[in-house]
């Protein structure tokens, strides 16, 4: 079987301040088993934006119904965007374990923030 791919179709997204940003991500398989996480930035200083497995992320909602057993769409919506949210967002698949280990990352989506229309 083909190895799982993480697909972020949008290289960039531009959103007006105060609006919501939708960041798209799909995977091509449910295997290997493990959660999806979203990060802003790359490397050891990256910021966790959403963790499917646990945590409280009040500004983030999943776009599709993540409780479907066959769900492979892990797109998210981030509300009330501000200029501080600008950056590149990565959708990352983890393989389950103790601890979970990073398996594959999407190519990233660059979020830019436009001034709020007056």
């Amino acid at each position: 079987e083909e190895e799982l791919q993480v697909i972020q179709p949008d290289k960039s997204v531009s959103v007006a301040a105060g609006e919501s940003a939708i960041l798209h991500c799909t995977v091509t398989s449910l295997i290997p088993v493990g959660p999806i996480q979203w990060f802003r930035g790359a490397g050891p200083a990256r910021e966790l934006i959403y963790n499917q497995k646990e945590g409280h992320f009040p500004r983030v909602t999943t776009v599709s119904e993540s409780t479907k057993r066959e769900n492979m769409d892990f797109s998210i919506s981030i509300s009330n965007i501000t200029p501080a949210d600008a950056g590149t967002y990565y959708c990352v698949k983890f393989r389950k374990g103790s601890p979970d280990t990073e398996f594959k990352s999407g190519a990233g989506t660059e979020l830019s923030v436009r001034a709020k229309p007056s």
């Epitope: 449910l30 295997i31 088993v33 497995k53 646990e54 119904e65 057993r69």
Partner: antibody, heavy 118, light 106 residues
């Protein structure tokens, strides 16, 4: 505190139909997938059916497929299981359970007893 | 189907391990305690190793490959119960349970 309270269990005759209910409180019901699990007298646990958070997607064990329907009313915080063509093999305590992000169970109701007897 | 031992026994204070196999690598595992037949199960562990906040720390879970293990460190008399392992398989979308392990505290 999370609470799940089942009702609707009864003594019924073979071939009859029954609808079980599970009323949820203490959490945002509409955000969670739910399942029904049963336990026949002297036996172990058996998963019966599951449903996604919105109710759009349903899943069934082979033992009940085609004669059971799981549904939910998120405005009433209530989960349902309608079972038809009941047989003695359906005699069991039926539990509703809240699903975790990966479709295991974290909270259970106290159960309701269904007895199928002529 | 998931396979677990029918029974285990231990003295108070000892460590007990209950294994569960057969789920494959596409599964997550949970552990459920039932103190009497027909009483509500209690979730001890889900997602292989996640313990709900109200469960005593003497209960822990782990998984390696297609085998999950429930460990009770310093078993107590009140831990006498039937312990079920449960699994969710991402290839079949189905939940399964083991037949249950009866723990007797001597």
């Amino acid at each position: 505190d999370v609470q799940l309270v089942e009702s609707g269990g009864a003594v019924v005759r073979p071939g009859e139909t029954l609808r079980l209910s599970c009323t949820a409180s203490g959490f945002t019901f509409s955000s969670y997938a739910m399942s029904w699990v049963r336990q026949a007298p002297g036996k172990g646990l058996e998963w019966v059916s599951g449903i996604s958070a919105s109710g759009s997607d349903t899943y069934y064990a082979d033992s009940v497929k085609g004669r059971s329907t799981i549904s939910r009313d998120n405005s009433k915080n209530t989960l349902y299981l309608r079972m038809s063509s009941l047989t003695a093999e359906d005699t069991a305590v039926y539990y509703c359970a809240r699903e975790t992000w990966n479709h295991l169970f974290d909270y259970w109701g106290l159960g309701t007893l269904v007895t199928v007897s002529s | 189907a998931l396979t677990q031992p029918a029974s285990v026994s231990a003295n108070p204070g000892e460590t007990v391990k209950i294994t569960c196999s057969g789920g494959g690598t596409s599964s997550y595992y949970g552990w459920y305690q039932q103190k009497s037949p027909g009483s509500a199960p209690v979730t001890l562990i889900h997602s292989d190793d996640k313990r709900p906040s109200d469960i005593p720390s003497r209960f822990s879970g782990s998984a390696s490959g297609s085998t999950a293990t429930l460990t009770i460190t310093g078993v107590q008399v009140e831990d006498e119960a039937v312990y079920y392992c449960g699994g969710y398989d991402y290839t079949t979308y189905v939940n399964t349970f083991g037949a249950g392990t009866t723990l007797t505290v001597l």
